[in-house]
Interface confidence: low
């Protein structure tokens, strides 16, 4: 985390004397562009608390590393929240302070509070000046919830949020209804984006163990301690007024920290300096207690005494947190009885040990079954322990049996025996079988006998096309099941070979021998037969074909429509992807173009034979459409319909076509040509009684024009049923549009 | 005068779907915390889910966990409840009623509707 | 089936003082206050006690409430006709995120 602390000095008396600071400890912070990084920013934050606006606040800057905010002149201009960014780059980063009035109606029992993902959040605004009016509690500016006067317990207001999640983060307030809003209890709650205890993008990694009252940052792992402690999980104390990761930064004033409230990055917040609690932080810990708001027990066993700002000062003789533990022969610890590693790897080995004197790095070693001494290449030494690490040399099947840690100091000696098994990674004896094969894959049963050890964690099956120095292809699949192997080239010859690894590191053992499997792909031998086309406008064809019937699955992935103009020696193709398809739609053709049109089936990259060609003249492009179409019910079988020519004609009109279909019908409309163009109205007759029918119709020079409106009309009564739709007394066959 | 008025009861067969509507008046609604309850024929009442005034937090019992779900819509006034699943236990009297702040008491209750879920 | 245990029944005279119980444990009773609703036949549930021993307005102190541990218990002086009902006891539990009701006691007047 960045070494970020806003500090405020909460001695109210005079408002004058309020000041903010905000120090870095990161190299080269607070200097601007002719450093390192952008400078610190220390600001009053407006958008949430809102206060009146008054003279406007000096900043500071004291040397490279620290601002100072001064000048407010009335206690209610350090209510709300104030940030301080500091950092560069992907470290820029935002510490915020929540300010209370300490006059206020309601205060809250704890400003900052911390959850983890899941957890209850439990708010408390206690009540300082009672008004009998409703509480409102807003997050982050926005109504969030009403709590009725009498609802108090305690003398308490509590909110609570169970389930918090990160989103839920935020200042929250709790006000009287009328009240000022300088007069609210402000909060500032932190949704860690993680369960207790882990950290990492899936929440997936373990927490250290932050000591003291640190938290660990959801992002990175790392502890943010609290003022006054330092070190990876904050285990050690500062001196008294000292602050920052490394200590390295001194409370201001000969009453050391005693007054001032620290801030550090989230997911930490503000508490005052180790020693002190309190609304203002200048109450001392009561006895017994110690740490950043006297949070921490001391608890000190075997004559140690509780200093309030580091913990238990243990006697001679004792050390550990609670001075649990007697200084004594050194002792290894928690060495396990039993480990296993990969032939030919190098692991690393550690061993722990305590004790007074402190083993150290030379007084650790490891000891291998043939009588060969390892010496630890690094130690971490942490406040109760010394760990030491070995980097084993490749390891042989020899090295199999019981090894020895053996720690040995002034005071005495411990050892440990353990177990290591060294494991053959396995290698197949076999080649994978082919199950089943496609055009485009392979179905492989990829599990075979072994040399080596087992468990089999995973099996990686590489495979290439046969002859080719591509690389290879590799799929982890899981050893009880099949594999497919997709998206091959129909017709191929493809290397195949597995791969077993066992668990742990350096458990991949050698590839297996190779086998060949071929994918298939028959050439279709099927010629489709053109049925017929009809024209659907003037750039579009409607294009049907058949196949001859033959046992068997059907050898083909679709069809391939080929257009020919020959006038412009242009090819249009059309890809029907199902080989269940016999017609297609053409669209976006030339009107008033011959083409010629053929159809073939096609399976993998392979084309079947095509049909015999056909030739197709589409029509010019056609009139516009008749208007004001009319339908009238003359009987229980006959509809008259009235129309008006098309306006601007490119030429005479050779014929009009109606279009009839029955209203919600499934089936396919009938089209009745009539025949004499200069003719504004027709009787459909030979319609079925008391039906709904839908018409439009539509002209023709040289080809076809567009639809007018549809309209609507139902024959009258009950009749027979027709035989169906003719228009005058010509029959509808004889006027079908086929 | 605080008024909740239920509707969209019936009867459906198991596995199929109901959505409970809840009209208040008569006080600020996008103020309080909503709840759905329910009576089994000649049996005690059952809490079923409760839904926080800005529609962002939302709880349902172990019973309908799933299953149902909880909305409100502050610009007409309306609490919701989409049932799916329904089962034959789930044959009851839906009450929606009104939070209470912290005490969480219900205060105002509506008369109820009925859902019979039966083959 | 009901997290909060009352009795089935009870009954009174009128002018007669009557208490109904209701026990819990340390994740409902234990640790939230109780609230009382009166039933009246075929209507729906009415608050009558909140937190344990307060009255909404309109509520007559013949009725009162209390909390100890983890039970609670709603009592009813000078019993009135116009009581017979059914009193369900409710309290919120920590552990389920939500209220929990009694099977409800059918007080009948005699």
């Known amino acids: 985390a960045v070494d970020l602390t806003l500090l405020a000095n909460l001695r109210l008396t005079d408002p004058q004397r309020f000041f903010l600071t905000c120090v870095s400890g990161e190299a080269g912070a607070g200097r601007g562009s002719d450093a390192w990084g952008p400078p610190l920013l220390l600001e009053k934050d407006d958008r949430i608390v809102r206060t009146p606006p008054g003279p406007p606040l000096r900043l500071a800057r004291n040397g490279s590393h620290q601002v100072t905010l001064r000048g407010f002149s009335k206690p209610s201009d350090l209510v709300g929240v104030f940030s301080c960014v500091g950092g560069a780059g992907a470290r820029r980063t935002r510490v915020i302070y929540v300010h209370n009035s300490p006059g206020a109606h309601l205060l809250p029992d704890k400003v900052t509070h911390t959850v983890n993902k899941g957890d209850t959040a439990v708010l408390s605004a206690r009540v300082h000046k009672e008004k009998q009016t409703d509480v409102i509690w807003k997050s982050n500016g926005s109504y969030f919830y009403t709590l009725d006067w009498h609802e108090a317990q305690d003398g308490r207001f509590l909110l609570q949020l169970p389930n918090v999640q990160p989103p839920s983060s935020g200042i929250y307030s709790a006000t009287y209804l009328e009240a000022s809003p300088l007069g609210s209890a402000f909060f500032r709650l932190i949704v860690r984006g993680c369960g207790a205890g882990r950290w990492g993008p899936g929440c997936t990694k373990e927490c250290p163990g932050c000591l003291h009252g640190g938290v660990c940052h959801d992002h990175d792992g790392e502890c943010v301690c609290p003022p006054g402690f330092t070190g990876t999980r904050c285990e050690q104390a500062c001196r008294e007024g000292r602050f920052g990761q490394s200590c390295q930064e001194q409370c201001p004033g000969i009453s050391g920290c005693r007054g001032l409230t620290f801030c550090l990055p989230d997911p930490y917040g503000c508490s005052c300096g180790s020693g002190w609690r309190g609304s203002q932080c200048q109450e001392a810990c009561a006895p017994g207690h110690f740490g950043a708001d006297c949070r921490l027990q001391c608890q000190c066993q075997n004559g140690g005494t509780c200093d309030r700002f580091s913990g238990c000062v243990c006697p001679s003789g004792w050390h550990g947190v609670h001075c649990e533990k007697s200084d004594r022969i050194p002792q290894i610890l928690n060495m396990a009885s039993e480990l296993e590693f990969n032939l030919e790897t190098m692991p690393r080995i550690n061993c722990a040990a305590a004790g007074n004197p402190f083993p150290v790095r030379g007084s650790i070693e490891l000891r291998k079954p043939d009588g060969t001494v390892l010496l630890s290449t690094k130690a971490i030494v942490e406040p109760e322990k010394t760990t030491a690490e070995f980097e084993v040399p490749r390891l042989v099947l020899a090295d199999s049996g019981f090894w020895e840690c053996r720690v040995s100091t002034s005071g005495g000696q411990d050892s440990r025996r353990f177990k290591v098994n060294v494991k053959v990674p396995p290698v197949p004896l076999a080649a994978p079988r082919l199950l089943t094969k496609q055009s485009r894959q392979l179905v492989v049963s990829p599990l075979v006998s072994f040399s080596g050890d087992g468990p089999i964690s995973t099996v990686r099956l590489h495979y290439r096309p046969q002859d080719s120095t591509m690389d290879w292809s590799t799929i982890v699949v899981d050893p009880s099941e099949n594999v497919t192997l997709m998206n091959l080239r129909p017709k191929t010859g493809y290397s195949v070979r597995v791969q077993l690894s066992r668990p742990g590191e350096g458990g991949e053992g050698a590839w297996g021998p190779p086998t060949l499997m071929t994918t298939d792909c028959p050439e279709p031998l099927l010629q489709p037969w053109l049925e017929g086309w009809h024209v659907e406008g003037t750039d579009r064809l409607r294009v049907s074909w058949s196949l001859p019937l033959v046992p068997g699955p059907l050898v083909g992935d679709g069809f391939l429509l080929r257009l020919w103009d020959g006038t412009r020696g242009q090819e249009r193709r059309e890809n029907v992807s199902s080989p269940q398809a016999r017609t297609a739609l053409l669209t976006g053709l030339t009107p008033g173009t011959h083409y010629q049109l053929d159809v073939q089936l096609y399976h993998c990259t392979l084309l079947g034979p095509a049909s015999p060609p056909a030739h197709v003249l589409l029509p010019p492009s056609g009139p516009p459409a008749p208007r004001h179409l009319h339908a009238q019910a003359l009987s229980d079988s006959e509809i008259q319909l009235t129309w008006k020519h098309p306006e601007a004609l490119p030429g005479p009109i050779s014929k009009y076509v109606v279009e009839v279909q029955v209203a919600g019908g499934a089936g396919d409309p009938l089209w009745i040509d009539v025949d004499r163009p200069e003719e504004t109205s027709t009787i459909i007759r030979g319609l079925n009684a008391s039906t709904r029918y839908l018409f439009r119709m539509r002209a023709s020079i040289q080809g076809l024009g567009d639809w007018s409106n549809t309209v609507e009309e139902s024959t009258l009564g009950n009749g027979l049923q027709a035989e169906g739709p003719v228009q005058e007394s010509r029959a509808a066959e004889e006027g079908l549009d086929q | 005068e605080v008024q909740l008025l239920e509707s969209g009861g019936g009867l459906v067969q198991p596995g199929g779907s109901l959505r409970l509507s809840c009209a208040a008046s008569?006080?600020?609604?996008?103020?309080?915390?909503m709840q759905w309850v329910r009576q089994a024929p000649g049996k005690g009442l059952e809490w079923v889910s409760s839904i926080y005034p800005s529609g962002g937090i939302t709880y349902y019992a172990d019973s309908v966990k799933g299953r149902f779900t909880i909305s409100r819509d502050n610009s007409k006034n309306t609490l919701y409840l989409q049932m799916n699943s329904l089962r034959a236990e789930d044959t009851a009297v839906y009450y929606c009623?009104?939070?209470?702040?912290?005490?969480?008491?219900?205060?105002?209750w509506g008369q109820g509707t009925l859902v019979t879920v039966s083959s | 089936q009901y997290e909060l245990t009352q009795p089935p029944s009870a009954s009174g005279t009128p002018g007669q003082r009557v208490t109904i119980s209701c026990s819990g444990s340390s994740s409902n009773i234990g640790s939230n206050n109780v609230n009382w609703y009166q039933q009246l036949p075929g209507t729906a549930p009415k608050l009558l006690i909140y937190s344990n021993d307060q009255r909404p307005s309109g509520v007559p102190d013949r009725f009162s409430g209390s909390k100890s541990a983890t039970s609670a218990s709603l009592a009813i002086s000078g019993l009135q006709s116009e009581d017979e009902a059914d009193y369900h006891c409710?309290?919120?539990?920590?552990?389920?995120?939500?209220?929990?009701f009694g099977g409800g006691t059918k007080l009948t007047v005699l």
């Open positions: 409710a309290a919120w539990d920590d552990s389920l995120n939500g209220p929990v």
């Open positions: 008569g006080f600020t609604f996008s103020r309080y915390k």
């Open positions: 009623a009104r939070g209470r702040g912290t005490t969480r008491a219900f205060d105002y």
